[in-house]
Interface confidence: low
């Protein structure tokens, strides 16, 4: 009997391993998982098991390659392949990812459900267990506060609109005697937006009073700030390549001057760089390093250190943009990644939003308000506590992806 019990335990473990790995490489997670997508690029889709066992939720199940290989070889889903030397796995080339069309996004949105009423100490495993008989679930996102505490609400993606509909329309659903609020995700956002509208008038009044009180202080600070930045602005213009981006400028000046801010929109034909030190020095060093010919993406560029009134106006605008960026970051309670005017300095603790595969750990704060940006069925910048997270890079290289998929 004991042997049979052991077999059952092993079968249960193997099922969990398959479920976990098939989630990582599945239709929902893989398109959103920057780390895995990068890994897949490197070696015809193969990912070393050495890397896989650093993923937290798999790591908790097993770190034994043989157990993983054995489990996957029994999987009925046949999603995964194992390399001949049994050290790597990949999503089967015969099962490519679905194309992320608007139709597909819409489909995901229509089978996404909001559920509220779980105790804040509930774990992902508790929730998985509760959902076990509620239909085929592809993804669970535990919503978290700024301080990474579980908010008691989740987003769930079902495998079909039918199963989502059936779940939402089942009356009287409870979690351990607690009534649950269950809505389609779309309906939840509509409800949230209504509430926000109500709060806006009140918020505007409060903001106006605060603004007036702060204005005097800010004006004083701005003058001081302006003086410190005189001579630090470099304007660039020309027939720039449409793909020219701020990253190109960071690379161009990487060893020649510290960039504090770049006022430039992709596709524009000019922009302004704010350096920490004098722009003239940075420009001189960069020119020296490039034989006097400083180009952007092989295009000729006119470089001009700004002076006088033009400089003051440009500085004022940059300071306003920086302040706006900082305010957004504060009010959202999250890392702000600007779309038009980008920078490195105005994001406290900035990690430039890039996925890095080694080196400094960059963790995103949880986004208490990210719902409003979350209308494509793809969950917004998901930021989760290490404890409960399952969609993540290996623990040793813990950078959250910008567009993470959830906690499954």
């Amino acid at each position: 009997m004991a042997e049979n019990g052991d077999n059952e335990k092993m079968a249960a473990l193997e099922a969990k391993i398959c479920h976990q790995i098939e989630y990582y490489f599945g239709d929902f997670n893989l398109p959103r998982d920057k780390f895995l997508k990068e890994q897949i690029k490197l070696d015809e889709g193969w990912v070393p098991l050495e890397i896989m066992i650093k993923f937290n939720r798999l790591n908790r199940l097993t770190t034994d390659f043989n157990v993983i290989v054995e489990a996957l070889s029994k999987s009925k889903a046949e999603l995964m392949e194992i390399s001949e030397d049994k050290t790597k796995i990949r999503r089967s080339p015969s099962k490519p990812l679905p194309e992320v069309t608007d139709e597909y996004k819409n489909d995901v949105k229509n089978r996404s459900v909001y559920i509220k009423g779980f105790p804040t100490d509930a774990t992902l495993d508790d929730i998985k267990e509760w959902l076990e008989d509620k239909g085929q679930v592809l993804n669970i996102q535990m919503r978290r506060t700024l301080h990474k505490a579980f908010k008691g609400s989740i987003f769930v993606v079902f495998d079909s609109i039918e199963s989502a509909k059936k779940f939402v329309e089942t009356p009287g659903q409870k979690y351990k005697e607690t009534d649950l609020l269950i809505l389609f995700k779309d309906d939840y956002f509509a409800k949230k937006n209504e509430e926000r509208k109500q709060n806006k008038v009140e918020a505007k009044l409060r903001a106006k009073q605060e603004q007036e009180a702060k204005q005097k202080l800010e004006e004083d600070a701005e003058m001081k700030s302006l003086e410190e930045k005189i001579g630090c602005l470099l304007k660039f213009s020309g027939d720039l390549d449409d793909q020219t981006c701020r990253e190109d400028l960071h690379i161009l000046f990487s060893n020649h001057g510290e960039i504090k801010w770049i006022d430039f929109v992709r596709g524009a034909k000019e922009g302004i760089i704010l350096f920490k030190e004098k722009a003239k020095e940075a420009l001189g060093k960069a020119k020296d390093a490039n034989n006097g010919n400083l180009q952007l993406r092989n295009k000729e560029v006119t470089w001009e250190v700004l002076e006088g009134e033009v400089e003051k106006e440009a500085l004022k605008k940059i300071i306003e943009d920086q302040q706006e960026s900082l305010n957004k970051w504060k009010s959202k309670g999250r890392r702000f990644k600007g779309k038009g005017k980008g920078n490195k300095a105005a994001q406290p603790g900035s990690g430039k939003g890039k996925v890095q595969f080694q080196g400094k750990k960059t963790k995103f704060a949880s986004d208490d308000e990210h719902d409003e940006h979350d209308e494509n069925g793809a969950t917004g910048p998901v930021k989760r506590a290490r404890e409960e997270t399952d969609k993540e890079e290996p623990a040793s290289k813990q950078q959250k992806t910008e567009n993470g998929a959830g906690d499954q």
Epitope: K41, L42, D43, E44, W46, P93, S94, Q356, Q358, K397
Partner: antibody
Framework: EVQLVESGGGLVQPGGSLRLSCAAS????????MNWVRQAPGKGLEWVGQ??????????YYSDSLKGRFTISRDDSKSITYLQMNSLRAEDTAVYYC?????????WGQGTLVTVSS | DIVMTQSPDSLAVSLGERATINCRSS????????????LAWYQQKPGQPPKLLIY???TRESGVPDRFSGSGSGTDFTLTISSLQAEDVAVYYC????????FGGGTKVEIK
């Protein structure tokens, strides 16, 4: 961000030797195969050789035309791969690129120019 | 060694028109186990390293515009640029990795 930076190129006399380096960053170097590809001035791309990773016993493979003169090695602790070139000939003049990967090369360095001339 | 033969050597196409490059291998590049053709296409602009466009004969690399497409199986492959843009002027190479890698001779694409 994945980055590959080649160095060590320059002018060398026929019969001489040169060692090129490729410093990698932005990924777990030890997990992946590294390749060298070269391109003679105005000509096409030519695969030079490959070094695999530890699970593959650091096996090396070379283009038939270069076997015996060129040697690829790697130092996983420094995330660097090397191309040692001996008995250099004028026809070895080329830009040498290091690339990452097995079946396809998604990442390339900017290349380093080797000129073999007396 | 597997020999890769590209044609034509050069190609002049009007802006907005279709450009087609062929590549033939001396043996089949189709892997019976994975059902994939181990063929990739690269684009190289002057003074730059090559850039991966297509792998597994028809899978577009992320970030590559959808005007680029790859087709073919076994020994005959095609890269198509459906509507040539000025920035597509470059040399295009096919490469097999069924065995140790070998490149085609390249096809220079210019604007007519």
């Amino acid at each position: 961000e994945v980055q590959l930076v080649e160095s060590g190129g320059g002018l060398v006399q026929p019969g001489g030797s040169l060692r090129l380096s490729c410093a990698a960053s932005g990924f777990t170097f030890s997990d992946f195969w590294m390749n060298w590809v070269r391109q003679a001035p105005g000509k096409g791309l030519e695969w030079v050789g490959q070094i695999r990773n530890k699970p593959n016993n650091y096996e090396t493979y070379y283009s038939d035309s270069l076997k015996g003169r060129f040697t690829i090695s790697r130092d996983d602790s420094k995330s660097i791969t090397y191309l040692q070139m001996n008995s250099l000939r004028a026809e070895d003049t080329a830009v040498y690129y290091c690339t990452l990967g097995n079946s396809w090369f998604a990442y390339w360095g900017q290349g380093t120019l080797v000129t073999v001339s007396s | 060694d597997i020999v890769m033969t590209q044609s034509p050597d050069s190609l002049a196409v009007s802006l907005g028109e279709r450009a087609t490059i062929n590549c033939r291998s001396s043996q089949s590049l189709l892997d019976s186990r994975t059902k994939k053709n181990y063929l990739a296409w690269y684009q190289q602009k002057p003074g730059q390293p090559p850039k991966l466009l297509i792998y597994w004969a028809s899978t577009r690399e992320s970030g590559v515009p959808d005007r680029f497409s790859g087709s073919g199986s076994g020994t005959d492959f095609t890269l198509t640029i459906s509507s040539l843009q000025a920035e597509d002027v470059a040399v295009y190479y096919c490469k097999q990795s069924y065995n140790l890698p070998t490149f085609g001779g390249g096809t220079k694409v210019e604007i007519k």
